[in-house]
Amino acid sequence: AFGISGVQKYTRALHDSSITGISPITEYLASLSTYNDQSITFALEDESYEIYVEDLKKDEKKDKVLLSYYESQHPSNESGDGVDGKMLMVTLSPTKDFWLHANNKEHSVELHKCEKPLPDQAFFVLHNMHSNCVSFECKTDPGVFIGVKDNHLALIKVDSSENLCTENILFKLSET
């Protein structure tokens, strides 16, 4: 288990961090599932997209999201081990012109249609909390992560090292 102090070293600077350039350094398609292998799916309902966390039927095709990786600049003294690397932020887009957004007031995760440059609410700091799993921390609200609550995506506050590896903020990325 990893202590939260390592996370806080970096996330203290998130409010001030700026994206390096306007283009992602890397993009690829992947399906998103929970730690317990439920799929994250997206459905168009009443001209807006809804996000669901559900078990797929056998051979049912998984929805893909476009993961775009952006380098973030932040003070070098925030680096925990002197590495030269830049913190990575991601945006997630399941369909053209729509991106996952953090709604910090409602503690919800929503799909919004928007144009580039994307707002800060669409950027998430990427973490490797657990082997083969990633977590998404809100750029706009350090310590708050995308998580699963009542079969929906929600924003979950992580306030202790015990909660850092909690299953409901762990996600798997799969290219198949």
Epitope: A30, V83, L126, S131
Partner: nanobody, 121 residues
Framework: QVQLVESGGGLVQPGGSLRLSCAAS????????MGWHRQAPGKQRELVAV???????NYADSVKGRFTISRDNSKNTVYLQMNSLRAEDTAVYYC???????????????WGQGTLVTVSS
């Protein structure tokens, strides 16, 4: 500290082949993806190809069908097989990796120093 060391660049004739390698070392906990970018003189750096830990790949349109990216997860090494090389492939090729270290869960972007590929007759 995470280091990326590239090798395999050089001078090759049009239509020829080269294989680039990039090895990552240091306090690596997890590697999310490894990839190659290139920068030609007077141009911006551009993505060539990327391979994820799960084996998914993405290629720039200009190299599809000619370049193949592969990865040895156990060695944290990525390869770029470049066939049917053209003059416009001349550039410095940079290795890029997204990885977390033992001191932090945050995924960071690391770059190699680059290796020069020159395609000329």
């Amino acid at each position: 500290q995470v280091q990326l060391v590239e090798s395999g660049g050089g001078l090759v004739q049009p239509g020829g082949s080269l294989r680039l390698s990039c090895a990552a070392s240091g306090s690596i906990r997890t590697v999310n993806y490894m990839g190659w970018h290139r920068q030609a003189p007077g141009k911006q750096r551009e993505l060539v190809a990327v391979v994820t830990s799960g084996g998914g790949t993405n290629y720039a349109d200009s190299v599809k069908g000619r370049f193949t990216i592969s990865r040895d997860n156990s060695k944290n090494t990525v390869y770029l097989q470049m066939n049917s090389l053209r003059a416009e492939d001349t550039a410095v090729y940079y290795c890029n990796a997204a990885a977390s270290t033992y001191s932090s869960t945050v995924v960071r972007s690391f770059w190699g120093q680059g290796t020069l590929v020159t395609v000329s007759s």
